[in-house]
Interface confidence: low
């Protein structure tokens, strides 16, 4: 007879990332006796919920339960039944819900209330659903990538993402791009963080970190596109918008009511003499880039230096991990390689945007047209945001590393969020035997 393996002494945690365009469920696992070690938590599953982000359910909240079912059932299968009751479940909603809350606190609360009631029906230890702040989103993303890169550990890290080792313990900055917001978070070099709203202090594993973070609401790739369209339709002489950010030959009808639905386009709202307009792609990277730059107000800065819209940004320092849509878009465009210079990226974007829509559809037959049509804009937007928004240069471009996963775990805010809420990042460096810690992030 075979020997039965001893049951693993492991723990699990679930985090749902309720983003503006979709919801993803992540399952994390770690050895129970090593909770306070750095780098022991890893992702065992990602389940993408079918459908849009939860903010889109505002008029059909009764459908939220069904919407979450598949991924919650998947969690039930992956996590051993004996562990269900002690597995914490957290849902964090990001910029899509921040925008809904700006429009109506009541509607946002109604959505979260139904989400909470739906998640409470499962046998896990549900810990609540909340809209996290942009500052939290930035901070937890920074914690995630540095935890996975072993930056908080005194031991050598498992995994090197750069071909050279400068200072092993120097943290990476985090660049996160979502559908509705984008975050930049890093430790500046001996620089005062002039704006208190952008300053975070952490003590992690016995070391102090002074971290700069900012979340630009309305500057995620989807909301940036809505902003650009709302801005450009103001000068259109009729209901045809010749748009350089879409491929030549591409056509799409847009409802004006959809354009002005989001708070992000309020600043460009005007009474138009038509209810619909047609985007006609002309595929010109340079013109697209110029149009995008008009979304960034760089004329006003009350600090020693700014990103855009009067927001303080210290001089960039060190290496940066660029993840979420930064990674997905650049991966699709085949531009994530460390060897591709900024000049080369720009060159390739020029060629890509100029390709006729019919040709693009043929080349990428398996990709949904809605997503396929927006890669020219998204790629151009990423370049504009990084270069003109955050002031990366051709030289500092090589310090940006487009990251999807690190050691099998997705780069993003969810892991850092769970580590914090489960008290798994101690303020002091743990001794060789696990101790109980009272001070956490």
């Amino acid at each position: 007879t075979q020997n039965k393996a001893l049951p693993e002494n492991v723990k699990y945690g679930i985090v749902l990332d309720a983003g503006s365009s979709h919801t993803s469920l992540y399952i994390y696992k770690w050895p129970a006796e090593k909770e306070n070690d750095t780098g022991v938590v890893h992702q065992v599953e990602e389940c993408r919920v079918k459908g849009p982000g939860i903010s889109k359910f505002v008029q059909k909240v009764n459908e939220i339960g069904i919407y979450l079912t598949d991924c919650m059932e998947r969690a039930r299968e992956v996590i051993p039944r004996s562990q269900h009751q002690e597995t914490p479940v957290y849902l964090g909603a990001t910029a899509g819900m921040r925008l809904l809350r700006m429009e109506s606190e009541e509607l946002a609360d109604r959505v979260l209330d139904v989400v909470e009631r739906s998640l409470s029906n499962y046998p896990f230890d549900f810990q609540g659903a909340r809209i996290i702040t942009g500052q939290e989103e930035g901070a937890y993303g920074w914690i995630t990538i540095n935890y996975l890169l072993g930056k908080f550990s005194q031991k050598t890290r498992w995994f090197s993402i750069v071909p050279y080792e400068t200072n092993n313990q120097e943290t990476f900055g985090a660049l996160d791009l979502g559908g509705a917001s984008t975050q930049v978070t890093f430790v500046p070099q001996n620089q005062t963080i002039e704006s208190p709203d952008n300053a975070l202090q952490f003590r992690l594993y016995g070391k102090d970190y002074n971290v700069y973070t900012h979340s630009f609401l309305c500057y995620g790739k989807d909301q940036a596109l809505w902003q650009k369209l709302a801005k450009d339709i103001q000068v259109a002489s009729n209901e045809i918008l010749r748009d350089p950010c879409f491929h030549p030959g591409y056509k799409k009808v847009v409802n004006v009511s959809d354009l002005y639905k989001t708070p992000c386009t309020k600043r460009f709202e005007m009474t138009l003499p038509f209810q619909q307009f047609e985007i006609q792609g002309i595929g010109n990277y340079q013109q697209c880039h110029q149009s995008i730059l008009e979304l960034f107000n760089t004329s006003y800065c009350p600090y020693s230096q700014c990103a855009f819209n009067g927001i303080f940004l210290p001089p960039l320092q060190g290496d940066f991990g660029a993840f979420s849509a930064f990674y997905f878009v650049m991966k699709f465009l085949n531009l994530t390689s460390e060897k591709v210079s900024q000049e080369k990226v720009t060159e390739m974007m020029k060629k890509f945007c100029a390709q006729p829509w019919e040709e693009i559809k043929t080349s990428y037959a398996g990709v949904k047209e809605k997503y396929l049509s927006e890669y020219c804009f998204s790629g151009t937007y990423i370049l504009s945001l990084l270069l003109q928004g955050y002031h990366f240069t051709a030289d500092s471009w090589e310090h940006i590393h487009f990251i999807g996963k690190i050691q099998g775990s997705d780069a993003g805010w969810t892991l850092g969020y769970m580590l914090n809420l489960t008290n798994m990042i101690p303020a002091e460096q743990p001794l060789s035997t696990p101790l109980s810690h009272s001070t956490y992030v």
Partner: antibody, heavy 120, light 113 residues
Framework: QVQLVQSGAEVKKPGSSVKVSCKAS????????ISWVRQAPGQGLEWMGG??????NYAQKFQGRVTITADESTSTAYMELSSLRSEDTAVYYC???????????????WGQGTTVTVSS | GIVMTQSPDSLAVSLGERATINCKSS????????????LAWYQQKPGQPPKLLIY???TRASGVPDRFSGSGSGTDFTLTISSLQAEDVAVYYC?????????FGGGTKVEIK
Amino acid sequence: QVQLVQSGAEVKKPGSSVKVSCKASGGTFSSLPISWVRQAPGQGLEWMGGIGFGTANYAQKFQGRVTITADESTSTAYMELSSLRSEDTAVYYCARGGAKYAGRYGMDVWGQGTTVTVSS
Amino acid sequence: GIVMTQSPDSLAVSLGERATINCKSSQSVLFSSNNKNYLAWYQQKPGQPPKLLIYWASTRASGVPDRFSGSGSGTDFTLTISSLQAEDVAVYYCQQYYLYPLTFGGGTKVEIK
């Protein structure tokens, strides 16, 4: 129709602070950019700062002395001015609207004004 | 910041006559992406808050009589009252909302001759 109602007149000593409130009704407050403008006796209008999309901007002249905040739960914006001096005696107005990045149409709705007198 | 200069400081016009106020900005307030001038005109009567008359340099605000009109582009702007009425006695201000800090002209006092 949006209306802005401001708090009442204040008499303050030099060196103290004043906090003026501006309550909005009849509109979605969270998407209202709010500017604060003051007018000294017999003088013109002077923009102090504004708040929109949660971000405050201040005129250089008032930087460090003025704080503009908004409480969405009560649809109220606040302007606090510290280290008051006699030349801060003025009528303080809140108004909906502002700059290119906070309101497209100038300042189209104004509060009734709050008189602040700074005197020892 | 952008300096707004208004002229004249005061103006006395007979009832039913035309009143013209000028406003000059130290730099252009024309936003190229939408070809709009970020300039507004306000009217302020004694003891009252200012009232928006014109935005985007030439668009009348809701409820403003059509005797008020705005014109100009870039750096030079004009507010015209085509036929002055008694109720138009007030101080008029121009204001740019193109760049922070927002700035107002010094004001023009309009009286009846």
